[in-house]
């Protein structure tokens, strides 16, 4: 049981107060981490308080200002990055997002030599993606969908694609798609180590439907935004990986990375591309059917100036269960002699482990093992491999960074983490400098957050980088709601569950419930993680429990409850729900007259089908921004869990399981449906059908659509989103204002 | 893996043209710079023309610029030469390569003769 102190005492109840929604809202009770920008073995950036780029030396103790923020202002500078050889800073201004990982900006480069910005061959503006090499100061950018090269930033540019359209070819950037459900960043380019080559993407969307939708915004007509997004089953982008050689880009252009001939001979996407010498890449492609992986080690042949990725260095990863991977499959941590590499697959149990590639998958070493997973490799260095795990006390909800000293034999293992700060820790990420050299740690709950910097060899902190002391003394005369994690046993099942309990949490009472769900496909909602948000508030003020419950599909406890929704989304996420439902009525303070459920986005997917489940346990619930039908959700993410809507393959499956389908069952529940006008991510079409089914069945409900807004509701629509919600569950479970 | 092969070569007057083609096959090259080299008997292969594979960079000796003329036709394959003004010092066996930056590697043609003579 993870049990957050509520700091009640009855000498001090007086000067206690519950959390208001207002505190949520204005975001009183946030908290900071502390994230190194590492530029070195022992140094990294940091901006502090008043908005100074600071540079700290580890070792000898000293910092300095490497960049004002008179300097910072001159521009409206929200962003920054110096080049490796430490001549130039470029300052990014005018920020303007497009979707969840790309923005435009301008930039300005800054020469510390001379103190003053770089006039002559500026750059154009707005930039989509700019870096600078990764030695030296050479610049790739990306502008109107084309990459350009600078050797030097006063140089002039060198055109390196020429193809490049809006929405048709994008050249070092993502399209959408592969933006949100393939790459899960802004760029698609990567320097290599000592930036002698650059490799990049091209995407070929000219054949992808486009999903239209009207922006009011303030004008007489409303502007159509348009995006190539295939759903599931429609026309994909066609993606093409080339290299360019930077020191000679006008010798020899850039040159395309083959495709391995067994993912080649049918639709594929690629999912990442990994350096590993300046004459080495690796690059990993998936089959549209997503349970077929390859990974390509491919060499540069100095005769052609070319890319050679033989037969005998193509690694197979398939998965006969599910999909490949888990979200994403993993990517390489290659070791020092530049073929042998460290990545996480399921082994023969199920489990997602690190294994050690040599030369064949078949013959990989199992690094890690046991009925928990290993979730990420931070670093590899030549004598110790980082890596993070929830193997610690058999919680699945936990992280905890773990050393394996692979220099040894036999290789031990050691936690990092485990025993810090273990009831304030519980859950750890990490970031480390050159050559692990030091690292922080930044610790996310369950009690308050802490960063703290350690040594690399001796694991010793160094000191407390951010330990949100200014949160813990606004806390303290905050009555907060107990939280607890615990599992329930059903049917060989192991439901994980959060319980959110009020401050004077009374068994012997009776409390209404509110189900708080996602439920997606390899995702955890039930974290050892610190959060004061809109839930606290509910069962802080309004008295509710709350409960989070991670069912069938969701992450990291082996593949049987990973894959068992494969195929078949909708239905056993939401069998889960109702199952945990059941059992926390059967715990005896749960008023089963007054039981909700909400979500957003599949969260919201599911709590509409357990309203809709007919089993009368729901009074009301939310959905924000759902998913309704997979026929109307993206390609690479539906396609992966539940294959193609064709007849040949689950086009049953994918009309039996939308909300339409159950509109009739609604007719017992108060419903409140939301969605932005403006959602690129899960289109405000999945509410519309929604709301037109529910119509058609005459069946009264509740709705709230935010103009112009995305997939987020930010801004003001966030605070009238929670406020409006609020009024809905106090009404429905008949608590007074 | 990659065969070049000249044409167009022949013998001419001084201040007349001659147009050189240069035809690939095997490997695409379109992505790689293409470059006209001459030989003059008892001297040392000098370029005399080259286009980038960019297709609008090109560069020209002082000794041909405004003369000769380099073009490029990808999706045929094919390299030119556009000699005009032709002077006896022009006099060479005149070959097309691949050229790579800072390196010699022999994707050559075997060549073809250009004599200016009255």
């Known amino acids: 049981i993870v049990l957050r102190p509520s700091r009640v005492h009855n000498s001090e109840e007086n000067t206690m107060r519950a959390l208001t929604l207002k505190d949520i809202l204005n975001g009183t009770f946030s908290y900071k981490t502390f994230f190194p920008n590492w530029i070195s073995g022992q140094e990294y950036l940091h901006q502090s308080a008043d908005n100074n780029i600071v540079l700290y030396n580890i070792e000898t103790g000293q910092s300095y200002t490497i960049l004002s923020n008179r300097t910072m202002k001159s521009v409206n500078a929200s962003n920054y990055g110096l080049s490796p050889d430490r001549q130039f800073v470029y300052l990014e201004s005018d920020y303007s997002k497009l979707w969840r990982y790309s923005y435009t900006a301008t930039y300005y480069i800054y020469d510390l030599s001379n103190g003053e910005f770089v006039r002559g061959n500026e750059l154009p503006r707005p930039i989509q993606y700019l870096c600078w090499s990764p030695v030296g100061s050479k610049l790739a950018y990306v502008y109107q969908n084309n990459i350009y090269l600078k050797q030097r930033p006063g140089d002039p540019p060198f055109q390196i694609t020429f193809n490049g359209r809006e929405n048709k070819i994008f050249n070092g950037i993502p399209d959408w798609v592969y933006e949100e459900e393939m790459l899960a960043t802004k760029y698609a380019l990567w320097w290599s180590p000592n930036g002698k080559f650059l490799a990049y993407a091209e995407f070929n969307d000219t054949d992808i439907p486009v999903i239209a939708y009207s922006y009011y915004g303030d004008e007489q007509y409303p502007r159509t935004i348009n995006i190539p997004y295939p759903k599931a089953g429609a026309k994909n982008p066609v993606v093409r990986i080339f290299i360019i050689d930077t020191t000679y880009p006008a010798y020899v252009g850039p040159q395309e990375v083959p495709v391995p001939a067994m993912i080649a001979s049918s639709d594929y996407y690629f999912s990442w591309l990994t350096w590993v010498t300046d004459e080495r890449v690796c690059l990993q492609w998936l089959k549209r059917v997503q349970n077929v992986s390859v990974l390509s080690i491919c060499d540069f042949r100095e005769d052609w100036q070319t890319w050679d990725c033989p037969k005998t260095q193509e690694h197979i990863e398939e998965s006969r269960t599910g999909w490949a991977g888990g979200f994403f499959v993993s990517t390489p941590v290659f070791s020092y002699d530049a073929i042998s590499y460290y990545k996480i697959f399921s082994d023969k149990d199920g489990y997602k482990h690190i294994h050690y590639i040599k030369d064949t998958v078949e013959n990989a070493i199992q690094i890690t093992s046991g009925k928990w997973e290993a979730i990420n490799i931070f670093r590899v260095t030549q004598d110790s491999l980082f890596y993070s795990s929830n193997e610690f006390e058999e919680y699945p909800g936990r992280r905890n960074i773990y050393r394996i000293s692979i220099g040894s034999y036999p290789p031990s293992k050691k936690c990092v983490t485990c025993h810090l700060r273990k009831e304030r820790c519980q859950y750890y990420t990490a970031s480390f400098s050159d050559y692990a050299k030091y690292y922080a740690l930044v610790c996310y709950g369950p009690g308050i957050p802490i960063s703290t910097l350690h040594d690399g060899r001796t694991d010793q902190e160094i000191k407390i980088l951010e330990e949100n002391k200014e949160l813990e003394n606004a806390l303290k005369n905050i009555q907060l709601p107990k939280e607890e994690i615990k599992k329930l046993e059903v049917d060989e099942i192991t439901l994980w569950y959060k319980m959110i309990l009020p401050p004077q949490f009374d068994r012997s009472k009776k409390y209404p419930l509110l189900i708080q769900v996602y439920g997606g496909p390899c995702s955890q909602s039930v974290r050892s993680v610190f959060a004061v948000n809109w839930i606290s508030y509910l069962a802080s003020k309004e008295g509710m429990v709350i409960a989070l419950v991670d069912g069938r599909g969701t992450a990291f406890q082996g593949d049987k409850l990973l894959y068992a929704v494969y195929r078949k989304l909708g239905v056993y996420e939401v069998e889960d729900q109702i199952t945990a439902v059941r059992k926390f009525i059967e715990m005896g303070f749960i008023d089963e007259k007054r039981i909700a459920i909400w979500g957003w986005s599949y969260g919201g997917y599911v709590s509409s089908l357990a309203l809709a489940s007919g089993t009368g346990l729901f009074k009301c619930g939310i959905a924000v921004a759902p998913v309704s039908s997979w026929e109307y959700y993206a390609s690479v993410y539906t396609e992966r869990f539940m294959g193609l809507p064709t007849k040949d393959d689950n086009l049953e499956h994918y009309k039996n399981s939308t909300v339409m389908a159950r509109a009739e069952y609604f007719r017992n529940v108060d419903y409140l449906l939301i969605h932005g006008t403006a959602d690129d991510n899960v289109h405000f079409q999945n509410s519309a059908q929604i709301a037109k089914a529910l119509v058609n069945a005459q069946v009264d409900f509740q709705a709230m659509w935010y103009s112009d807004q995305n997939h987020g509701l930010s801004g003001l629509s966030t605070n009238h989103l929670y406020t409006h919600m609020t009024h809905f569950l106090k009404q429905c479970f008949s608590l007074s204002d | 893996e990659v065969q070049l092969v000249e044409s167009g070569g022949g013998l001419v007057q001084p201040g007349g043209s001659l147009r050189l083609s240069c035809a690939a096959s095997g490997r695409t090259l379109s992505s790689y710079t293409m470059g006209w080299f001459r030989q003059a008997p008892g001297k040392g292969r000098e370029l005399v023309a080259s286009i980038s594979w960019v297709d609008s960079i090109t560069y020209y000796p002082d000794s041909v610029e405004g003369r000769f003329t380099i073009s490029r036709d990808n999706a045929k394959r094919m390299v030119y030469l556009q000699m005009n003004s032709l002077r006896a010092e022009d006099t060479a066996v005149y070959y097309c390569?691949?050229?790579?930056?800072?390196?010699?590697?022999?994707?050559w043609g075997q060549g073809t003769q250009v004599t200016v003579s009255s």
């Open positions: 390569a691949v050229i790579f930056p800072e390196q010699v590697y022999d994707y």
